[in-house]
């Protein structure tokens, strides 16, 4: 990656740390499989950070499937429910903060948040449940943290965030605490790579939250999800900002990196949208 621009990043000798999922399969999407049975099962939802019910067809699927809520929680939720995440890195707003709200093409309408560049604040919007763009956050806090300006007119991730012991949800805390190696970036960085539904073989990168690195994958040209970047640098910029590591000598080392203004463009022509 070329190294000449104005984005401040932390340099360390090692890769930034991975998301502390107890098992990598906890990040898999719920998969009902091809069979037609109706079996109540549970899976871990990385967006809500909770174990949730789904209907399993009875065959195939993946490992993110549990007989009981308790088993799911045991395998995929952490005991240290009061772990604290702290980010202290000053940054520019990511490009996607300036995108218009985009409900996508599905019809499972839910409340999400986007950064409204006209009002300069995060606001709720009606999201259809699929596609859309990256200016789409599950919580107000996440939106503010990534897209709203800090008090001095620059972007600063200054939220201590505590995992709520009751429902595993992230809630803002004002306490200043030492940083731990936890993920506090956009939620789509936690989704698995998704080839999509078409037949092309485009070279793309996705953020692998289990190993904490951006990795190449082949994209079909349509569908998929938002964990999809045209360059490794773009992937790192969007997803690695969620990890903040304290350097042992106590300071942050800054570097300048070339910023490519390229954005992911997803073709929608051949998408088959299931009823939601």
């Amino acid at each position: 990656d070329s190294e000449e621009d104005e984005e401040h990043t932390i340099i360390t000798d090692t890769e930034l740390p991975p998301l502390k999922l107890m098992h990598s399969f906890c990040a898999f999407k719920a998969d009902d499989g091809p069979c037609k049975a109706i079996m109540k099962r549970f899976f871990f939802n990385i967006f809500t950070r909770q174990c949730e019910e789904f209907i399993y067809g009875g065959c195939e699927g993946n490992q993110n499937r549990f007989e009981s809520l308790e088993e799911c929680k045991k395998m995929c939720t952490r005991d240290n429910a009061n772990r604290i995440i702290k980010t202290t890195l000053q940054q520019e707003k990511p490009d996607f903060c300036f995108l218009e709200e985009d409900p996508g093409i599905c019809r499972g309408y839910i409340t999400r948040y986007f950064y409204n560049n006209q009002t300069k604040q995060c606001e709720r919007f009606k999201y259809g449940g699929c596609l859309g763009n990256m200016n789409n956050f599950e919580t107000l806090e996440e939106c503010k943290n990534i897209c709203e300006d800090g008090p001095n007119g620059f972007q600063v991730d200054n939220y201590g965030t505590q995992l709520n012991a009751v429902n595993n949800s992230l809630t803002p805390q004002s306490t200043k605490v030492p940083s731990l190696f936890e993920f506090h970036g956009p939620s789509w960085c936690l989704t698995p790579a998704d080839r999509g539904l078409c037949r092309a073989n485009e070279n793309r990168f996705y953020y692998n939250s289990v190993i904490g690195k951006c990795r190449p994958f082949k994209y079909s040209g349509c569908g998929g999800n938002e964990n999809n970047f045209t360059s490794k640098q773009e992937c790192l910029r969007a997803c690695k900002k969620g990890f903040i590591q304290r350097i042992s000598k106590g300071g942050l080392i800054k570097t300048k990196r070339k910023r490519k203004k390229q954005r992911v463009k997803i073709a929608y022509e051949e998408i088959f949208v299931k009823n939601m």
């Epitope: 949730e52 309408y109 839910i110 409340t111 606001e123 429902n167 949800s169």
Partner: antibody, heavy 119, light 108 residues
């Protein structure tokens, strides 16, 4: 003081249309969502839709999407709700209520407008 | 849409008694998106509780809210005469936003 003042009662025949108004004062009209909620006699509350006057963003309850039209006049800080093809089951009290841009805490409500649909 | 079912439809209690009003959702709703409103005859509803448990301005401390997922509860520890009204639960997690049919709290 925040106030939402709604237009007066309406008596309409089936098939007709009605346009209700809600005049806001005491706050920045364009910075909040305006919702319309109705309540049939002795019944619960039903959300019709919401409009954000600054950018004209509108979300409808699908049930009303073909019959309800939400508009707002920024110059007079007034929100409007027009309901067409009226039927007897549209007889209700119609409320406007505001919420912030981040949640749907309906913190201020109009006094309500009674719409009666009868032949 | 998410259907909110409130129970009981009518609750007849005396002042000083404890009241428990339930709201059940047809699908899971995040607790941040579950609100309660109070309505008295001839008046517009009033925001009463936001985010499952946060009392709106001016709401007495005898009121409390709890719950998660599909089950939510509004509790009044010791009823006062002014508490007798209709209470509606409301969700805005999913569109369309929906309300329960209401629980009427009446004096026995």
């Amino acid at each position: 003081e925040v106030q939402l003042v709604q237009s007066g009662a309406e008596l309409k025949k089936p098939g007709a249309s009605v346009k209700l108004s809600c005049k806001a004062s005491g706050y920045t009209f364009t910075s909040y969502w305006m919702h319309w909620v109705r309540q049939a006699p002795g019944q619960g509350l039903e959300w019709i839709g919401e409009i954000k006057p600054d950018q004209g963003r509108i979300n409808y309850n699908e049930k009303f999407k073909t019959r309800a039209t939400l508009t707002a006049d920024k110059s007079t800080s007034t929100a409007y709700m027009e309901l067409s093809s009226l039927r007897s089951e549209d007889t209700a009290v119609y409320y406007c209520a505001r919420s912030s841009v981040v949640d749907v805490a309906l913190d201020y409500w109009g006094q309500g407008t009674t719409v009666t649909v009868s032949s | 849409e998410i259907v909110l079912t409130q129970s009981p439809a009518t609750l007849s209690l005396s002042p000083g008694e404890r009241a428990t009003l339930s709201c059940s959702a047809s699908s899971s709703v995040s607790s941040s998106y579950l609100y309660w409103y109070q309505q008295k005859p001839g008046q517009a509803p009033r925001l009463w509780i936001s985010g499952t448990s946060i009392l709106a301005s001016g709401v007495p401390a005898r009121f409390s809210g709890s719950g998660s997922g599909t089950k939510y509860t509004l509790t009044i520890s010791s009823l006062e005469p002014e508490d007798f009204a209709v209470y509606f639960c409301h969700q805005w997690s999913h569109y369309p936003f929906t309300f329960g049919q209401g629980t009427k709290l009446e004096i026995k």
